[in-house]
């Protein structure tokens, strides 16, 4: 359903001081400037809707220009507790504490928040990414070491009058950026506590947050150039579907990925791309300015709507799912990586999706809104779209119920 409710104070309008407060690029994440401690220490922090810890580098590391020095902060409090976060690849570990935190280009407030001071990591920090920490904006259920560690946004809402909502506009450049260009470029906006009308066109359409852990949503249909993939919709959400600003690609469950690639290959068959391209290994290149966008299909994801039996669709262009990559060896060409990949943990709507849209994380009303981003990359023939309503029956059946592994289940 479109967003036609009456205006609520503080929830919408203009948030000039927060517009353009993000930098970075989809391949290495988008970051916001934050200050930690007293006196304030400035750090660039990755905006990640796929995790729930506020964690910052707190020891020297070859990829960090700077790090949080707890001993220099008069307001730091040690929680005398460690935290260890392993990923499929890599990990970080550190020590828990609290300190005063603010966002210079955000709401004019300072909050005491939990901070994981990262003392050791592997495959976490990215060389040249220009960020030194991560702001996990998801829910307490997935916080480490457990859900008793209050996430930053919960602390912010509790301690201030900031409404329980934030919105993200991630702006893909559409061309590769070198290091100096990234530092000088605008990456987008994180509007804390509201919605900025200047950042989108058309209407906002909302999908329910299925469960408050990740930002979990339900996909009910997938189309490639208007052709239905015709899979059992449970497959699209196996074992979950999440909106994650900390992931680069659109990641799809194995069966869905294979069907989608088959369909995209068929639609773009006027050119023969190597198998390695579909795997994300090989680049494809065209003479500068001649990328044949028209041979690649649009991809539509239908999301459960707010009203029974009603859905809406978000449509992305190849300009979103072909990621520009600079390579000196082929610098005379425009080269791209295929930014859709296979997942074993469900669908992940990463930067590839988010760069097409203004995305509203309306935690207060347990819903996520999508509208066409005012900064999305497109051509003169096609544009990203958010359209609805569509009639879709039995959408609840599309959600996958992850088997429980708690003690009560283990005892049965």
């Amino acid at each position: 359903e479109t967003d036609e409710e009456p205006e609520e104070p503080g929830r919408r309008g203009s948030f000039v001081e927060m517009v353009d407060n993000l930098r970075g690029k989809s391949g290495q994440g988008y970051y916001v400037e934050m200050t930690v401690g007293s006196p304030p220490q400035t750090l660039n922090i990755l905006v990640d809707t796929g995790s729930s810890n506020f964690a910052v580098g707190a020891a020297p590391h070859p990829f960090l220009h700077r790090y949080y020095q707890r001993q220099l902060s008069s307001t730091y409090r040690d929680l005398r507790k460690g935290v260890y976060v392993p990923y499929t690849q890599g990990k970080w570990e550190g020590e828990l504490g609290t300190d005063l935190v603010s966002i210079p280009h955000g709401p004019n407030v300072t909050v005491r928040a939990n901070i994981a001071a990262i003392t050791e990591s592997d495959k976490f920090f990215i060389n040249g990414s220009n960020w030194e920490g991560i702001l996990g904006l998801a829910y307490a259920e997935i916080a480490r070491p457990d859900d008793s560690l209050e996430p930053f946004f919960d602390s912010l809402v509790k301690q201030t009058h900031v409404p329980n909502l934030f919105s993200l506009q991630l702006c893909g450049a559409g061309f590769p950026l070198n290091q100096s260009e990234v530092l000088a470029s605008v990456g987008g906006s994180m509007i804390i506590g509201g919605i900025d009308h200047s950042l989108y066109t058309g209407s906002l359409w909302y999908t329910p947050i299925r469960r408050e852990w990740y930002y979990e949503v339900i996909i009910v249909r997938v189309e490639i150039n208007g052709q239905d993939l015709k899979m059992d919709c449970k497959e699209y959400n196996y074992d979950k579907s999440i909106v994650d600003s900390g992931t680069t690609n659109l990641r799809l469950p194995k069966k869905v990925f294979e069907a989608a690639v088959k369909s995209i290959k068929a639609a773009s068959s006027t050119e023969k791309f190597p198998d390695g391209f579909w795997l994300g290994e090989q680049l494809v290149c065209w003479q500068a300015g001649t990328t044949p966008w028209n041979i690649f299909p649009v991809i539509s994801l239908y999301l459960m709507g707010e009203v029974t039996n009603q859905s809406f669709r978000i449509t992305i262009l190849p300009q979103q799912y072909l990621r520009p990559v600079e390579d000196v060896a082929t610098s005379q060409d425009d080269c791209y990586k295929f930014a859709i990949s296979q997942s074993s943990t469900g669908t992940v709507m990463g930067a590839v999706i988010m760069e097409g849209f203004y995305v509203v994380f309306d935690r207060a009303r347990k819903r996520i809104g999508f509208a066409v981003s005012a900064c999305h990359v497109h051509d003169e023939f096609r544009t990203a779209a958010v359209e609805g309503p569509f009639v879709t029956l039995d959408m609840e059946d599309c959600g996958y119920n992850i088997p429980q592994t708690d003690e009560s289940t283990l005892m049965t």
Partner: antibody, heavy 116, light 107 residues
């Protein structure tokens, strides 16, 4: 500029293992896959496998699947190729190469000699 | 696996000559073919990608053509530094495969 620097020559006995390193610099390490190619003396080039440094995903030539292991250390931008159960016919120069379109960049090569 | 068959396996030529090396794939590989130059004791050097595109810094005397199964590398005017072995490679499907090489020698 892009550089792939490999570890030095190795002499191994049959049945042993060898681990060759390839240190990358001059580009965003996690953006490009690393391949391994070998060349026996006086012979042509043979692709062994590849690894994605961003997530350690690997794909091998079936011929080497049982004996080759590719690993990555992103903190040092280094990829490793370990070959086990060496035999005399594994005597070759082993190259790492970076992906892009085909293999635009190659390491200088590491000679592995297997001899009893 | 896709076989890449190069011909000739060796050739003798003089400085200034036009040299053509061919490569035949055992199945359709589109334009997903690269060419490399290798000198004794050195690593291969990339010359051509996507059948006909020169990598940055490669002299314009090197050119490539072809699609599907038949590919050609041409050196328009052979220079002293061009005496080497040349390999074609298909990167259309795994496992990636190379031709057996063409050795260009001084006549």
């Amino acid at each position: 500029q892009v550089q792939l620097v490999q570890s030095g020559a190795e002499v191994k006995k049959p049945g042993a293992s060898v681990k060759v390193s390839c240190k990358a610099s001059g580009y965003t390490f996690t953006n490009f896959w690393i391949h391994w190619v070998r060349q026996a003396p006086g012979q042509g080039l043979e692709w062994m496998g590849m690894i994605d440094p961003s997530d350690s995903y690997t794909k091998y030539n079936q011929k080497f699947k049982a004996r080759a292991t590719l690993t990555v250390d992103t903190s040092t931008s280094t990829v490793y190729m370990e070959l086990s159960s060496l035999r005399s016919e594994d005597t070759a120069v082993y190259y790492c190469a970076r992906s892009g379109v085909a293999f635009p960049y190659w390491g200088q090569g590491t000679l592995v000699t297997v001899s009893s | 696996d896709i076989q890449m068959t190069q011909s000739p396996s060796s050739l003798s030529a003089s400085v200034g000559d036009r040299v053509t090396i061919t490569c035949k794939a055992s199945q359709d590989v589109g334009r997903n073919v690269a060419w490399y130059q290798q000198k004794p004791g050195k690593a291969p050097k990339s010359l051509i990608y996507s059948a006909s595109h020169r990598y940055s810094g490669v002299p314009s005397r090197f050119s490539g053509s072809g699609s599907g199964t038949d590919f050609t590398l041409t050196i328009s005017s052979l220079q002293p530094e061009d005496f080497a072995t040349y390999y074609c490679q298909q990167y259309n499907s795994y496992p990636y495969t190379f031709g057996q090489g063409t050795k260009v020698e001084i006549k």
